[in-house]
Interface confidence: medium
């Protein structure tokens, strides 16, 4: 993908409500294009704020106070609704709403919408066509939940409209904006260090690669040309300044690390892979 | 700068029919819902009908439903409202509004006069 | 339906004057309430929506408060401009519905 972000892509916001008690409440809400977050919202003075220069897209200044109106209304009713009917959908203090909703554009064109609620992390509630529908598993609970969500067909409409209408045509905007940003090639820098013994007479060797941009990225321990199927991946993890870090790890016999290298592929290198040599590492690590 | 303006008013016998037409520009047409409003002589004002920015969506009040059908071609920036059986009380100027993401209607036309009378 | 109730129907107040127009539901609208302003023979103008956001381009002697079922606007200090009738209308559910009006008249 040209953008350097993984088809299909999403922009969703998620919206993550903690009820201590019933007057004590923490809400935190945040924007992303698929990984990447672009936005967040300031709690205290009602407003959204731009993570990245390109974060507003092609909206117009109009268009974005109409949102940050609409978030606004929207997290002051959430919490009196959830507050008022947590007795009655037996929701028991302390708990955790998480919702998230979006859109996705699959090679360009616009590919669905999304729309989910979970309660204390489990799958309860979902925004279908143009009403809330429980999760099978979720229960009565869900079923009464999604009554009280299906009041207001009003409410319900708007929410349609966000999801069918708004998102993908903000969607559409940041990519363009972004372009710059999201096209960019980092090239990765990679290291090689001693990870904790597993056990007498064998060795942990690591390969660090980090600093790279876009996520996707090929890393492996290698004896000549031939992979090593022991290599494990970890996470992809974010950095600061915007670009990802790796690493990968490999459990040998002391005997056997001489002749193991680490080849990392990514698309700055331009089919020049990186690739270091064990036997050429420092043994301080 | 956002810009509505309503024709297609006039005088009508009661039972007839009018179509208003809203031309729209300035703003991402297709991307909202519209309304038509309307306002009685010497009265308040009274939502009619609305329509969501795909066209996929339409509401009307009460006191039309039925009679009155709201439609738009994007292709074209424009609103309708076809109005079909009219009656004494549809006497009034017709507004088309710009609904804000449904919260408001924050641009409206200058409005239109339709006169149902025999 | 929604019924809004505004209050008073009618007022007269000098320039410089504040002045407060009230707005009630027949339900609960949380803050989907929003002000407009009409003069004679034009169209209405929002002045505020969701309560308490300032529509761009209204001056800042207009403000709106309120949610649930009681809604207030004020002018801080009235001007020539502002003699005209004031509606408020929710939009917390379909259909839409206005107050019958305020109307604001010369001392």
């Known amino acids: 993908n040209a953008d350097g972000l993984k088809e299909p892509l999403s922009f969703h916001v998620t919206w993550i409500a903690s009820f201590y008690n019933h007057s004590w409440k923490q809400n935190l809400v945040s924007g992303w294009l698929s990984d990447l977050q672009t936005h967040t919202w300031d709690s205290n003075s009602s407003t959204i704020v731009f993570l990245c220069p390109w974060s507003r897209g092609n909206f117009s200044n109009e268009e974005w106070k109409e949102l940050e109106t609409l978030f606004r209304i929207r997290t002051i009713r959430s919490f009196e609704g959830i507050r008022r009917y947590a007795h009655e959908l037996q929701f028991e203090y302390p708990f955790e709403i998480q919702v998230t909703g979006g859109c996705e554009l699959h090679s360009g064109k616009v590919s669905g919408s999304f729309l989910q609620l979970a309660y204390q992390g489990s799958d309860f509630v979902s925004f279908q066509n143009n009403s809330w529908l429980p999760y099978p598993v979720a229960g009565n609970m869900a079923k009464h939940f999604c009554k009280v969500l299906n009041q207001n067909q009003h409410e319900n409409d708007i929410t349609h409209n966000l999801l069918s209408d708004t998102c993908p045509r903000f969607i559409l905007g940041l990519l363009d904006a972004g372009k710059a940003h999201l096209q960019r090639q980092v090239k990765p820098e990679a290291w090689l260090s001693h990870g904790p013994s597993p056990g007498p007479g064998h060795l942990q060797l690591v390969c660090h690669v980090s600093g790279f941009y876009p996520k996707p990225v090929w890393v492996m321990w290698m004896r000549g040309e031939q992979e090593q199927q022991g290599t494990q991946r970890g996470d992809i993890l974010p950095s600061a300044d915007g670009t990802w870090y790796l690493r990968a790890t490999l459990e040998v016999a002391a005997g056997e690390a001489a002749d193991l290298s680490c080849r990392v592929k990514h698309s700055s290198l331009e089919g020049q892979d990186i690739v270091l040599y064990w036997e050429h590492h420092s043994s301080v690590g | 700068e956002v810009q509505l303006v309503e024709s297609g008013g006039g005088l009508v016998q009661p039972g007839g029919s009018l179509r208003l037409s809203c031309a729209a520009s300035?703003?991402?047409?297709?991307?909202?819902?519209m309304s038509w409003v309307r306002q009685a002589p010497g009265k308040g004002l009274e939502w009619v009908s609305a329509i969501s920015g795909s066209g996929g969506s339409t509401y009307y009040a009460d006191s039309v439903k039925g009679r009155f059908t709201i439609s738009r071609d994007n292709s074209k920036n424009t609103l309708y409202l076809q109005m079909n059986s009219l009656r004494a009380e549809d006497t009034a100027v017709y507004y088309c509004?710009?609904?804000?993401?449904?919260?408001?209607?924050?641009?409206w036309g200058q409005g239109t006069l339709v006169t149902v009378s025999s | 339906d929604i019924q809004m109730t505004q209050s008073p129907s009618s007022l007269s107040a000098s320039v410089g004057d504040r002045v407060t127009i009230t707005c009630r539901a027949s339900q609960s609208i949380s803050s989907y309430l929003n002000w407009y302003q009409q003069k004679p023979g034009k169209a209405p103008k929002l002045l505020i929506y969701a309560a308490s956001s300032l529509q761009s381009g209204v001056p800042s002697r207009f403000s709106g408060s309120g949610s649930g079922t009681d809604f207030t606007l004020t002018i801080s200090s009235l001007q020539p401009e502002d003699f005209a009738t004031y509606y408020c209308?929710?939009?917390?559910?379909?259909?839409?519905?206005f107050g019958q009006g305020t109307k604001v008249e010369i001392k």
């Open positions: 209308q929710q939009s917390y559910s379909t259909p839409p519905t």
């Open positions: 300035g703003f991402t047409f297709s991307s909202y819902a």
């Open positions: 509004a710009k609904d804000a993401l449904w919260l408001a209607f924050d641009y």
